[in-house]
Interface confidence: low
């Protein structure tokens, strides 16, 4: 399977909400022993490998923001921890999964990574990630609503065992 990032850049005004999205593509094993661990984190550009560094999103780590379920099942973070920080990650039946960030501030600007790990029995992992940029703007030049820019290539780099 692969991860697609429909949009590579999100430009939003301060105070707005934004939903960053990734999509799981390709054949997904629906075996009873297969589960998918999906999560989000911040990273930085200029690394040898994009998304290799895992930084918290609003002080929440990738462990805090995880979704954990079978293939194309729906799920969302219901725990108060994320919602208290104005965050919610969600996944639908079609392989889309997202993180919603409420009341954006300039500090939210940066590179965001989605991660999908396929877990079989023990830890024979197959993992892929996608990256996207969020720019939060303020002042007279800021857009009134979020503007999204499609990825030049819909598929992000397919990385196994990142």
């Amino acid at each position: 399977f692969k991860v697609a990032t429909p949009y590579s850049l999100y430009v939003c005004p301060e105070g707005q909400n934004v939903t960053l999205t990734c999509r799981l593509l390709g054949p997904v094993d629906k075996g009873h022993d297969v589960t998918f661990y999906k999560t989000w984190y911040r990273s930085s550009r200029g690394e040898v490998q994009t998304c290799s560094e895992r930084r918290p999103i609003r002080n929440l780590t990738f462990q805090d923001l995880h979704l954990h379920h079978g293939g194309h099942q729906a799920a969302n973070t219901s725990h108060d921890l994320a919602q208290r920080h104005g965050l919610e990650s969600a996944s639908d039946h079609h392989g889309n999964f997202s993180i919603t960030m409420r009341n954006l501030t300039l500090l939210d600007s940066g590179l965001y990574c989605c991660l999908v790990v396929e877990i079989r029995h023990h830890h024979s992992e197959h993992r892929v990630h996608g990256a996207m940029e969020l720019q939060v703007q303020t002042g007279k030049d800021a857009p009134s609503n979020c503007v999204v820019y499609p990825s030049s290539s819909q598929d992000s780099e397919n990385i196994t065992a990142a």
Partner: antibody, heavy 120, light 112 residues
């Protein structure tokens, strides 16, 4: 701050059972496997097994099957390990430890350890 | 079970010296997915173990760059380029490629 708070020391008689606890705080409890590790005489470490707090799935070291039982209570973010039919061989420090990357077997946060002493 | 053999058992060093600890596994630690799950921990007296290096050579967050890990297959090494007082304790290697996970017997780093 991510923490694993373990229950206090236990003194048990041979043949008895003991249940020790490990309360997680500062992170989403269901996001990573919880592992249990035995340490004898402050030296060797032995992996007992782990539990996926989300599903309750367990994986045991064959050596500890029948000796240790791992459970979780998601509502209180607490992992438990019960040891039964205790003998002097079970006297040790027992640690709970969080798997850093969900289920890959390297542990970034450890409890302070619970000392179990088995003596008549 | 995979047996992890560490050498030396004890390593007396002077502060500022380089230290090297070897860990050998009884079978290859290369997983079928291509990763090698070999890790290093430091346990200071009276404390819990702390993760230093994971998957052979990745330094864990906050670990100083004087620590480095290397190796492949069955032979692995932890190097400390300039030993400091806070580095003293028992070092354990560990593998999680095969169940059960297993640990080495430990190497005690002490002042010469």
């Amino acid at each position: 701050e991510v923490q694993l708070q373990q229950s206090g020391p236990e003194l048990e008689k041979p043949g008895a059972s003991v249940k020790i606890s490990c309360k997680a705080s500062g992170y989403s409890f269901t996001g990573s496997n919880m592992n249990w590790v035995k340490q004898n005489n402050g030296k060797s470490l032995e992996w007992i097994g782990n539990i996926d707090p989300y599903y309750g799935y367990t994986t045991y070291n064959q050596k500890f099957k029948g000796k240790a039982t791992l459970t979780v209570d998601k509502s209180s973010s607490t992992a438990y390990m019960q040891l039964k039919s205790l003998t002097s061989e079970d006297s040790a420090v027992y640690y709970c430890a969080r798997d850093y990357d969900y289920a890959l077997g390297y542990f970034d946060v450890w409890g302070a350890g619970t000392t179990v002493t088995v003596s008549s | 079970d995979v047996v992890m053999t560490q050498t030396p058992l004890s390593l007396p060093v002077s502060l500022g010296d380089q230290a090297s600890i070897s860990c050998r596994s009884s079978q290859s630690l290369v997983h079928s997915n291509g990763n090698t799950y070999l890790h290093w921990y430091l346990q200071k007296p009276g404390q819990s173990p702390k993760l230093l290096i994971y998957k052979v050579s990745n330094r864990f967050s906050g670990v100083p760059d004087r620590f480095s890990g290397s190796g492949s297959g069955t032979d692995f090494t932890l190097k400390i380029s300039r030993v400091e007082a806070e580095d003293l304790g028992v070092y354990f290697c560990s593998q999680s490629t095969h169940v059960p996970y297993t640990f080495g017997g430990g190497t005690k780093l002490e002042i010469k």
